[in-house]
């Protein structure tokens, strides 16, 4: 007889998932030497315990905590760079910006990027067939639980002078529902944090508006100040100068607004 | 490139010991889980035992656990193999393999040496 399983509306577990993981882990620790005091085999068996023969719509923060642990990383606290809704100029950024860092640019966030997983409650398979949609399903699924929780472990790390890379060609440039406005404004620690710098990234070749001036900005503007935490705000009119004056700063092209 | 060559292999009498090493070279070896496999004569490989990359996490089939200790040093890149208590049935070409590590009983390999025979027989 067919053992019944929960249809959910979001797509199911990434293919070769378990490999995904340790073949992520073996390749970070290859390129930070500073990690190679990671247990890849211990990672991937706290990253599936947090989630194997648990209800995929019931996972907790604290499913995550044995991971939390063995991924505990020092990233420069003065370093690091937010982004909602432009992942790959934030990652095409700090590849050329190597001191800086993007929450997947650390372990854990390097071994989930992109990635989906689930289970199942009482089983100790993984669902490559379907699980838990944010919206249509719940929001204790076993991704958007993860993500809040390095997400909210990275934004507390931050300090000095934090940024974050907005995309200026969405309708709501800065969007409070967003893991950004949702977790990781509402984390940046006061007493460490003293500036929040906003990049709006323009779209459009001839678009010369000051998105800083948008009014999700200023709503984002609003809550940070009332955080104690100052707010500055710059417009990036062109990306791919932008990123070609953060490769070669010399260029005589690069003094100019970008 | 990588290159993992295995040494130590030989003929034994039942009830002996053995040790097998595996020199690694070519990649990043604090970074690889590694394992013992073994094919016997005229059989399919059999896994035998494996060790996490930082030497934390051990593995043994049940037909060698509380027999044989697979070690790892870092520092000098080579794996280990302490073979007690020998049988007739451990007969078998020992391969040395480094992957990924493992996921329940599926082992994700990446590389393998060329062998070392190892013959029980009194």
């Known amino acids: 007889v067919p053992r019944w399983r929960q249809q959910w509306s979001g797509p199911g577990t990434t293919k070769r998932f378990p490999e995904t993981v340790l073949a992520r882990c073996v390749k970070y620790t290859e390129i930070h030497p500073e990690m190679r005091h990671v247990d890849c085999q211990s990672v991937w068996d706290a990253f599936k315990g947090a989630f194997i023969s648990k209800h995929p719509c019931n996972i907790t923060e604290e499913d995550y905590q044995p991971l939390m642990k063995l991924g505990t990383q020092t990233v420069p606290c003065n370093k690091i760079l937010l982004w909602s809704r432009i992942k790959d100029l934030a990652h095409q950024f700090t590849q050329v910006q190597r001191d800086m860092f993007t929450l997947e640019d650390t372990l854990l966030g390097y071994l989930a990027d992109d990635l989906t997983w689930c289970g199942e409650f009482n089983t100790s398979k993984i669902n490559y067939q379907s699980c838990p949609d944010w919206r249509k399903d719940c929001s204790n699924n076993p991704v958007s639980v993860f993500w809040k929780t390095v997400s909210r472990r990275f934004a507390e790390a931050a300090c000095d002078v934090v940024h974050v890379m907005l995309n200026g060609s969405r309708s709501k440039i800065f969007d409070k529902n967003s893991t950004f406005g949702s977790v990781e404004v509402h984390n940046l620690q006061p007493e460490k944090v003293q500036t929040l710098e906003a990049w709006v990234i323009h779209g459009g070749r001839e678009d010369s508006r000051d998105l800083c001036q948008d009014p999700t900005i200023k709503e984002l503007e609003s809550i940070i100040s009332k955080r104690n935490i100052q707010f500055s705000c710059k417009n990036i009119y062109r990306p791919d100068k932008f990123l070609q004056c953060v490769k070669n700063p010399e260029d005589s092209s690069c003094t100019s607004e970008i | 490139e990588v290159q993992l060559l295995e040494s130590g292999g030989g003929l034994v009498q039942p009830g002996g010991s053995l040790r097998l090493s595996c020199a690694a070279s070519g990649f990043i070896f604090s970074s690889y889980a590694m394992s013992w496999v073994r094919q016997a004569p005229g059989k399919g490989l059999e896994w035998v035992s494996g060790?996490?990359?930082?030497?934390?996490?051990?593995y043994y089939a049940d037909s060698v656990k509380g027999r044989f200790i697979i070690s790892r040093d870092n520092s000098k890149n080579t794996l280990d193999l302490q073979m007690n208590s020998l049988r007739a049935d451990d007969t078998a070409v020992y391969y040395c393999a480094s992957g990924k590590g493992w996921d329940g009983n599926t082992w994700y390999e990446d590389y393998r040496g060329q062998g070392t025979l190892v013959t029980v027989s009194s």
């Open positions: 060790i996490s990359n930082t030497g934390i996490n051990t």
